[in-house]
């Protein structure tokens, strides 16, 4: 089909790329997210330094085929789905009728993607169309994150298996850029 990807196994067609973090929504110290400067890791936030045992953010492995229109990946890809209730584990009783239910107090924490990886896949298409070459963005790890009023709730949804084309007037962004130059943009992204 015009290309071959391999290392030791000449049939390999789903090479993986390195992991990298999604840009954080806010950088209080205004440092840039230049990989070469900080290794690609966002600065720690004070509310994330608690004992991890206070949180229950589960990473569920999920295997699926990648599709783009009628085309489907030759092999399935594996990524994580972030699941579970995040602490801190302070719970307050709330009476509803005769029973009680419990809800966390304090800031709203969510279990969300922390790091992503890019994986190159080849999609096989019907009708003699050439296989499509794609790099997909897959969740590599999860973390408990405090939501702020800036966060876009719609972005908590899992990624679909269908390709999302860039919206009109909205520019796809490079995966690593200066936080200072893109502060407003980052406020709506994890």
């Amino acid at each position: 089909q015009g290309w071959q990807a391999f290392k030791n196994d000449a049939t390999e067609i789903i090479p993986e790329l390195g992991e990298y973090p999604e840009p954080p929504p806010e950088l209080e110290n205004n440092k840039t997210m230049n990989r070469a400067e900080n290794g690609g890791r966002p600065p720690h936030h004070p509310f994330e330094t608690k004992d991890v045992s206070e949180y229950s953010c589960r990473e569920l492995h999920f295997t699926r085929y990648v599709t783009d229109g009628p085309c489907r990946s030759a092999k399935p890809v594996t990524e994580l789905v972030c699941s579970g209730q995040c602490g801190p584990a302070r719970l307050l009783p709330n009476a509803i009728g005769r029973g009680k239910w419990w809800r966390p107090s304090g800031p709203d924490f969510r279990c969300i993607p922390d790091r992503y990886r890019a994986q190159r896949v080849q999609l096989l298409c019907p009708g003699g169309e050439a296989p499509r070459a794609r790099k997909v963005r897959l969740v590599a790890s999860c973390k408990c994150k405090r939501l702020t009023r800036f966060h876009n709730q719609s972005e908590l949804k899992d990624f679909g298996t269908e390709a999302a084309r860039p919206q009109k007037g909205r520019k796809p962004r490079p995966r690593a850029r200066s936080a200072k130059a893109n502060q407003a943009e980052l406020e709506n992204a994890y």
């Epitope: 089909q1 015009g2 290309w3 990807a5 391999f6 290392k7 390999e12 090479p15 993986e16 790329l17 390195g18 990298y20 230049n34 990989r35 070469a36 290794g39 690609g40 990648v66 783009d68 890019a118 190159r120 080849q122 169309e129 050439a130 296989p131 499509r132 070459a133 794609r134 790099k135 997909v136 963005r137 876009n152 719609s154 972005e155 949804k157 990624f159 679909g160 298996t161 269908e162 390709a163 999302a164 084309r165 860039p166 919206q167 909205r170 520019k171 796809p172 962004r173 490079p174 995966r175 690593a176 709506n188 992204a189």
Partner: antibody
Amino acid sequence: QVQLVQSGAEVKKPGASVKVSCKASGYTFTSYDINWVRQATGQGLEWMGWMNPNSGKTGYAQKFQGRVTMTRDTSISTAYMELSSLRSEDTAVYYCAREEEYYESGSLFYYYGLDVWGQGTTVTVSS
Amino acid sequence: DIQMTQSPSSVSASVGDRVTITCRASQDISNWLAWYQQKPGKVPKLLIYAASYLQSGVPSRFSGSGSGTDFTLTISSLQPEDFATYSCQQANSFPFTFGPGTKVDIK
């Protein structure tokens, strides 16, 4: 600043091999794929293949399959492209280029562009 | 392999002119197309990715459009520094083939 610096010009005889190096600086070498592109004098650009510096995985255009090998040395942030069994039509300027990926939040796929290029290495194949 | 063709192969224009270059793919590539500018003796420079998105630092007089098999690069008002060769590249299927280039020179 982000840059790719390639090795110097080479003159080779038909049948020989050439190995061109591409040293990255100003960014994390293992975070971006490297593509190799060549251009014969007065001709258009010709894509040869890509390499993932993190895993060492590669993908080559079928035209070069069996003759080209793309490798890397992460300790010195350098990518290499070796072309063997050289013939006169391989005379060209060889470029390494960084493959940037652009995404829209919530999108499944990345968008492609070669955003940083090496200065080019002229390879002349002549008997 | 997907074949990329460009027209015209060359165009003579004056400063201030509007220039349109067409790129055609031999099969549907959706919006998986990039445009590059190359000046004599220089390295290619990325102008447009995903068919219509302007690369950071590229002047807004450059724009790209199209989807499927037909694409255009438009320079709204040609500047002296824009005289160069422009090439398209498809990134839909391996190998990522380039068009032959369109040379924009001074009339």
